[in-house]
């Protein structure tokens, strides 16, 4: 069952975060998720990685998607499974790693035109409607446009970054763009190697914020360079 | 910025009940599922249960599945776990917590938003 793969994993046991709770003990705010706390626990690699429960795609990191472990689709509790490579099978486009989206049952490489072109036009339909969706896992169910009286905050629709609030960026979610927190020292960025290569994303992330650049963690050693992961870096 | 703050935690006997509360805010609550994890002492983080962003769909550890329900109102922000038939293993401090979702590759629970936690103690 999921929780016997939940259990030998040893969810539960996890060495506790060096400074306790992420926003430290005594402080109801949470420090910014990423790759690093401020003394806390560095990022787990691959090796030492636990299941990570969800209820939707959105939850997991942009290497991964929510779902059962088991073949059969256990009603029951899903985790966060590794994202499919080129040429596997998929259901859905969450289920394709970055660069990559679902056709046909099948992970395809984001052709940029093609795939580009498809986001945007969805992008423009969303907003000419009264229901348009709010971030990437609103696909299913959409929402009314009351909800944006936090325009500007976190998860609100955005066009380009002047409409996010301080700290914001606009950046693409699925198929609408929303505002979404500018990186951080020590979180996750993405290098792009070509320039217009962030129109192939389907989960964008906002750029370093001030003072801040990306570049390749130094102590994450990976067999190819194209693997190497990138994080906020004071310059 | 995004906080949450629990409440409710208590000292109780075995077979005792507590409800703690979640107050949410500075992101939109609606739109997240946001789940309970605990940590007793000298241990890490252990997921106990999930709520979709409807309240629609739960999900509950094997130790707390029957004892223990998630619910969530949207309209205050809150998020609540009715604990019940408490056992001494479930003396932990309770956080409510938010995936950190896509600015992270790989989801951790060290990842997560969380508040300051609620120190919940089962004790005869």
């Known amino acids: 069952t999921l929780n016997s793969v939940l259990n030998s994993n040893a969810i539960k046991n996890l060495p506790p975060p060096l400074g306790g709770a992420a926003g430290h003990p005594g402080s109801a705010v949470s420090a910014a998720p990423g790759i690093l706390y401020p003394g806390g626990n560095k990022y787990q690699t691959i090796d030492n990685y636990q299941p990570y429960p969800c209820a939707e795609d959105e939850e997991c990191g942009t290497d991964e998607y929510c779902a059962s472990p088991t073949r059969g689709g256990d009603a029951g509790v899903q985790i966060c499974l590794a994202c499919r490579k080129r040429r596997k099978r998929c259901m859905r486009h969450a289920m394709c790693c970055p660069g990559n989206y679902c056709k046909n049952g099948i992970c395809v490489s984001s052709d940029q035109n093609h795939f580009r072109g498809e986001i945007e036009e969805t992008i423009t339909e969303s907003f000419g409607n009264d229901h348009s969706t709010l971030d990437g896992y609103s696909r299913r169910t959409t929402l009314s446009s009351k909800m944006y009286h936090t325009k500007g905050q976190e998860g609100s629709v955005c066009l380009r970054s002047s409409d996010c609030a301080s700290g914001l960026c606009c950046a693409r979610h699925f198929w609408s763009k929303i505002c979404k927190p500018v990186l951080k020292e020590g979180q996750v960025c993405t290098k792009h190697r070509r320039k217009g290569s962030h129109g192939l994303e389907i989960f964008q992330r906002c750029y370093c914020g001030e003072g801040l650049s990306c570049r390749i963690q130094k102590d994450h050693h990976q067999a190819s360079n194209s693997s190497r992961l990138h994080t906020c870096q004071r310059h | 910025k995004v906080q949450l703050v629990e409440s409710g935690g208590g000292l109780v006997q075995p077979g005792g009940s507590l409800r703690l509360s979640c107050a949410a805010s500075?992101?939109?609550?609606?739109?997240?599922?946001l789940k309970w994890v605990r940590q007793a002492p000298g241990k890490g983080l252990e997921w106990v249960s999930h709520?979709?962003?409807?309240?629609?769909?739960?999900m509950y550890a094997d130790s707390v599945k029957g004892r223990f329900t998630i619910s969530r109102d949207n309209a205050k922000n809150m998020l609540y776990l009715q604990m019940n038939s408490l056992k001494p293993e479930d003396t932990a401090v309770y956080f409510c917590?938010?995936?950190?979702?896509?600015?992270?590759?790989?989801?951790?629970?060290?990842?997560?938003?969380r508040g300051q936690g609620t120190q919940v103690t089962v004790s005869s």
């Open positions: 917590a938010r995936s950190a979702g896509k600015v992270v590759s790989r989801a951790s629970l060290e990842n997560d938003y």
């Open positions: 500075g992101f939109p609550f609606s739109i997240y599922p």
């Open positions: 709520i979709s962003r409807d309240g629609g769909r739960t």
